[in-house]
Amino acid sequence: AQEVQQSPHCTTVPVGASVNITCSTSGGLRGIYLRQLGPQPQDIIYYEDGVVPTTDRRFRGRIDFSGSQDNLTITMHRLQLSDTGTYTCQAITEVNVYGSGTLVLVTEEQSQGWHRCSDAPPRASALPAPPTGSALPDPQTASALPDPPAASALP
């Protein structure tokens, strides 16, 4: 079965810095979402080879991509405290396949020592069960936000 390898599991960065999240699959994708989980989970990007990526307005101008949809590195720049959270890759194949998640801890510089990543991958056990056409290696899924962002794209 198709899997999404996502790295890193966790990263601690100061305000204003950048972070790389890599989503890798064995291929055969139509595209890939990066979704931020939390009380109001939301799509951050949708990336499809040969198509202009869709980016949520909160991240416009501070996201870069390298690689292809099968092995995509997403760089988020100028991180803010509010960007702290768990980010999950959702690969679109004939089913939905999810990565294990990346916990991004954005800290004020003086408090960096207080917030450290553990080696364990992020878990999201309180989240709802995935759709039936989904494949999840971990209890990790994504729900939608009540008021969707004004991000609209059409290839």
Epitope: Y33, D43, S143, L145, A151, S152
Partner: antibody
Amino acid sequence: EVQLVESGGGLVKPGGSLKLSCAASGLTFSSYAMSWVRQTPEKRLEWVASISSGGFTYYPDSVKGRFTISRDNARNILYLQMSSLRSEDTAMYYCARDEVRGYLDVWGAGTTVTVSS
Amino acid sequence: DIQMTQTTSSLSASLGDRVTISCSASQGISNYLNWYQQKPDGTVKLLIYYTSSLHSGVPSRFSGSGSGTDYSLTISNLEPEDIATYYCQQYSKLPYTFGGGIKLEIK
């Protein structure tokens, strides 16, 4: 059992507006993308709008800028706000659960929209 | 946009017949093709997804095949409840597009 029930259809004049609703039950609504599809009087099916589970919205050129899809996860309701309606928007409008970005596995019974002066 | 073509608009067959309905895409769609059944009362159901995967609860007499641009739906043993209109739909690329539909009637 998953159920989708559309409402809000009716007769509207060209240039007018209408808001359709789709009440969902029997599923974890917030976990799914959702779509609207319409069927013209000639029985052609046309995709109208989609919203991903994380809130991204997608439209064909024919309705972009006139229609807005949205969702209320607390109430398990999908919406389609339609404005600047034209006679060619006359159709039966169905909401559908979008299992995997375009794979529409459950459909409602539809609601009729007629645009006529 | 990808155009989906179902060459005939209606088809007549006898109960027990094997019926094949075709659909072609204006470009390759990598098997991202669904088949839907619409009953005379307007009810729409998914039959086949991703070219050949049978949706849950759909009788095994329905099957799908194809690749590239050419796809087909086969009903192996036509039953009275199969009287309906059948639509193909590609979901390889936005905008999602449907074929014009084939109305299946009993001889």
